[in-house]
């Protein structure tokens, strides 16, 4: 169904990183506009991005209300300048998105090494606990606060003078690793949610090397 001068949206795709969540779709509009609606499985539809010519809609504010809920969105197509017009079935043309569960599906953003501190033959590497857009009691929660023990980090490190790498794991935001005294090391971290089957790992953090600002060193 539909009018002769509107086409239904297609390729509806969720793009989400650390809960910042945008719905994208096609096609670029020609003489038409879009409105997006979102709901939980049991909830009412809420309209967003009214009569837009964009092909994306930021739905972060809605999904952060409960990141463990499963959401469905739909994109309505209207003729430009005649948004009252409906399809032949008496309702606007629309297309449904895939279901989306933020807690299970949001991509893990690239982590950042906050600091490293050497004491003798030990180095403590700390991963920045990034703030998300998920709120609780008016406060933005960190990634660790949202995911708890479901979130882990994997450290990859090597001597600056060598290509041979090692790895270590933590389910906190800190690593304590053994190093050779007098050697500089380079570090990179990756976030991981072991219980997931998709979107389990983040991209690697930028590499940080000892002797280049970030760390503090104590003999």
């Amino acid at each position: 169904s539909g009018t002769t001068n509107t086409v239904a949206a297609y390729n509806l795709t969720w793009k989400s990183t650390n809960f910042k969540t945008i719905l994208e779709w096609e096609p670029k509009p020609v003489n038409q506009v879009y409105t997006v609606q979102i709901s939980t499985k049991s909830g009412d539809w809420k309209s967003k991005c009214f009569y837009t010519t964009d092909t994306e809609c930021d739905l972060t504010d809605e999904i952060v209300k409960d990141v463990k809920q499963t959401y469905l969105a739909r994109v309505f197509s209207y003729p430009a300048g005649n948004v009252e017009s409906t399809g032949s079935a008496g309702e606007p043309l629309y297309e449904n998105s895939p279901e989306f569960t933020p807690y299970l599906e949001t991509n893990l953003g690239q982590p950042t090494i906050q600091s490293f501190e050497q004491v003798g033959t030990k180095v403590n590497v700390t991963v920045e606990d990034e703030r998300t857009l998920v709120r609780k009691n008016g406060t933005f929660l960190t990634l660790r606060q949202v995911f708890g023990n479901d979130l882990g980090y994997i450290l990859t490190y090597r001597k600056s003078s060598s290509s041979g790498k090692k790895t270590a794991k933590t389910n906190t935001n800190e690593f304590l690793i053994d190093v050779d005294k007098g050697e500089n090391y380079c570090f990179s971290v990756q976030a991981v949610i072991p219980s997931r089957t998709v979107n389990r790992k983040s991209t690697d953090s930028p590499v940080e090397c000892m002797g280049q600002e970030k760390g503090e060193f104590r003999e």
Epitope: K165, K169, T170, P194, R200, K201
Partner: antibody, heavy 117, light 107 residues
Framework: QVQLVESGGGVVQPGRSLRLSCKAS????????MHWVRQAPGKGLEWIGL????????IYDPKFQGRFTISADNSKNTLFLQMDSLRPEDTAVYYC??????????WGQGTPVTVSS | DIQMTQSPSSLSASVGDRVTITCKAS??????LNWYQQKPGKAPKLLIY???SLADGVPSRFSGSGSGTDYTFTISSLQPEDIATYYC?????????FGQGTKLEIT
């Protein structure tokens, strides 16, 4: 369902090379760390190394560094172990395994390699 | 590198017995320890992960305990099908290391 199938084992002369494959199905290897483990006849399990197929990062037990090379072809969902300068003591069953970060949850059936003249 | 010392290397017990195997790490491995069962000609099978968590589908007679450097694997009531070799694995940092294995036999 998740499955790992190794192939490429066989009898090879000392000093020669061999390339083992591990074909994964039921999941994308790029979502996991993937490992190679071996077991010599009548002996224990020995970790060789791992790869993050998403970015190609590899980490080895130092005793295998330089002689063994782990790689992956994400388009074929397949893991490889290139073994060079083989020695009689490399005779073993070679396993690939999937790592969910808390444990190796799936293993292949193993492929036997015999290094003998 | 972290060394894993597993004991005993072999063990003979009767059906219904309580069986205990230990693994000692050369440094703190922060519970990144798994226990595997291996039967002849087969790949290892996961029993316990993160030192104390029972893997899916594994009978409750199997359990794990420990933290830091000392870990224990227990079969509360030995069954005939438990005849196998058992390995611990530390994966807290590379190179990952297995214990030497414990061969379990029934008397």
């Amino acid at each position: 369902q998740v499955q790992l199938v190794e192939s490429g084992g066989g009898v090879v002369q000392p000093g020669r090379s061999l390339r083992l494959s591990c074909k994964a199905s039921g999941f994308n290897i790029k979502d996991y760390y993937m490992h190679w483990v071996r077991q010599a006849p009548g002996k224990g399990l020995e970790w060789i190394g791992l790869i993050d197929p998403e970015n190609g990062n590899t980490i080895y037990d130092p005793k295998f560094q330089g002689r063994f090379t782990i790689s992956a072809d994400n388009s074929k969902n397949t893991l490889f172990l290139q073994m060079d300068s083989l020695r009689p003591e490399d005779t073993a069953v070679y396993y690939c395994a999937r790592d969910n970060s808390y444990y190796f949850d799936y293993w292949g059936q193993g492929t036997p390699v015999t290094v003998s003249s | 590198d972290i060394q894993m010392t597993q004991s005993p290397s072999s063990l003979s017990a009767s059906v219904g017995d309580r069986v205990t195997i230990t693994c000692k790490a050369s440094q703190d491995i922060r519970k990144y320890l798994n226990w595997y069962q291996q039967k002849p000609g087969k790949a290892p099978k996961l029993l316990i992960y993160y030192a104390t968590s029972l893997a899916d589908g594994v009978p409750s007679r199997f359990s794990g305990s420990g933290s830091g450097t000392d870990y224990t694997f227990t079969i509360s009531s030995l069954q005939p099908e438990d005849i196998a070799t058992y390995y611990c694995l530390q994966h807290g940092e590379s190179p990952y290391t297995f214990g030497q294995g414990t061969k379990l036999e029934i008397t």
